[in-house]
């Protein structure tokens, strides 16, 4: 399955939109930094078969979509930017879902992939827990926004490596 070029552009657009979503100066939030323990090895790409990498990408985008689809998220961000961001993520999910169906038919997805997907889910659980502990404060959301920009950048790099493998 070849991810369309529009998918990569969509990821870049999502990053730009997320970059525009900030409402307060991040400089006021330095003391709120937190170690979410991003599972960087899951974005390596070299250790995965293509089907596994696509599944990890799908989980990453799905969890990001879920995080920004909550009521608390709606209250934190400017509505039109949030809607555009969610639309970009939704389109990427559609692209990836088509690929997942196609690739899983070609490759048997081993248990290792379940571990990778679980690692991504636990990462997002840590992010959600942090927001709850910080009572969804503006600075907590700002830290999470920075973290998601970082993880989306890792996703973009993984997609680039996938395209080079084709």
């Amino acid at each position: 399955c070849d991810l369309p070029q529009t998918h990569s552009l969509g990821n870049r657009r999502a990053l730009i939109l997320l970059g525009q979503m900030g409402r307060i100066s991040p400089f006021s939030c330095l003391k709120d930094r937190h170690d979410f323990r991003i599972p960087q090895e899951e974005f390596d790409g070299n250790q995965f078969q293509k089907a596994q990498a696509i599944s990890v990408l799908h989980e990453m985008i799905q969890q990001t979509f879920n995080l920004f689809s909550t009521e608390d998220s709606s209250a934190a961000w400017e509505q039109s930017l949030l809607e555009k961001f969610s639309t970009e993520l939704y389109q990427q999910l559609n692209d990836l879902e088509a690929c997942v169906i196609q690739e899983v038919g070609v490759e048997e997805t081993p248990l290792m992939n379940e571990d990778s997907i679980l690692a991504v889910r636990k990462y997002f659980q840590r992010i959600t827990l942090y927001l709850i502990e910080r009572k969804y404060s503006p600075c907590a959301w700002e830290v999470v926004r920075a973290e998601i920009m970082r993880s989306l950048s890792f996703s973009t790099n993984l997609q680039k490596r996938l395209r080079r493998k084709d």
């Epitope: 970059g19 330095l30 003391k31 937190h34 950048s153």
Partner: antibody, heavy 121, light 107 residues
Framework: EVQLVQSGAEVKKPGESLKISCKGS????????IGWVRQMPGKGLEWMGI????????AYSPSFQGQVTISADKSISTAYLQWSSLKASDTAMYYC??????????????WGQGTLVTVSS | DIQMTQSPSSLSASVGDRVTITCRAS??????LNWYQQKPGKAPKLLIY???SLQSGVPSRFSGSGSGTDFTLTISSLQPEDFATYYC?????????FGQGTKVEIK
């Protein structure tokens, strides 16, 4: 390879203006903040201020607020430090360094080579 | 502003010695402390971040500890290339502040 390359040494007279630069390469320039640090001859490190190149938001140390201006041009991955009217006491080595912003990652992990500014009549 | 106080301001040691430098913050900074090494005519180099994390490429003889207000940089066995000035820096809040430095000289 991540690099921060600063402009060359400057010799200026009191009252003159100056703008020094710091060009980033080998990484996404807008994903990191750029900080500026002063080191006067034989002295320690002093943090001056910082810029987020993605939107040019800045924060200054109270000691340097109003004395210098920090700016950035993300289209050419370059941050700047400028003075409108130099004083002899501005004579120092100036370093730029990258900062991960709100991400949990090493602070000031890469530094420029420094720009020596000499102000003398 | 958060004041950072290093001690000692200078020390003399021999190759192979265990060296300890301390840094105290004027208020709690959790674990938001970095250590840098600077050699004459060179830019500072990050050694330790978030109080105890070793920066990539830094020898394991360097270690950091502490949280709250009191922090320590330890060099387990001093090497000839370690003679330099060391600075602590808080990254808890703006304005960011450095300690005054500790110069490690050859005995």
């Amino acid at each position: 390879e991540v690099q921060l390359v600063q402009s060359g040494a400057e010799v200026k007279k009191p009252g003159e203006s100056l703008k020094i630069s710091c060009k980033g390469s080998g990484y996404s320039f807008t994903s990191y903040w750029i900080g500026w640090v002063r080191q006067m001859p034989g002295k320690g490190l002093e943090w001056m201020g910082i810029i987020d190149p993605s939107d040019s938001d800045t924060a200054y140390s109270p000691s340097f607020q109003g004395q210098v201006t920090i700016s950035a041009d993300k289209s050419i991955s370059t941050a700047y430090l400028q003075w409108s009217s130099l004083k002899a006491s501005d004579t120092a080595m100036y370093y730029c360094a990258r900062h991960p912003g709100l991400n949990w990652a090493p602070d000031f992990d890469y530094w420029g080579q420094g720009t020596l500014v000499t102000v003398s009549s | 502003d958060i004041q950072m106080t290093q001690s000692p301001s200078s020390l003399s040691a021999s190759v192979g010695d265990r060296v300890t430098i301390t840094c105290r913050a004027s208020q709690s900074i959790d674990g938001s402390l970095n250590w840098y090494q600077q050699k004459p005519g060179k830019a500072p180099k990050l050694l330790i971040y978030f109080a105890s994390s070793l920066q990539s490429g830094v020898p394991s003889r360097f270690s950091g500890s502490g949280s709250g207000t009191d922090f320590t940089l330890t060099i387990s066995s001093l090497q000839p290339e370690d003679f330099a000035t060391y600075y602590c820096q808080q990254s808890y809040d703006f304005p960011l502040t450095f300690g005054q430095g500790t110069k490690v000289e050859i005995k």
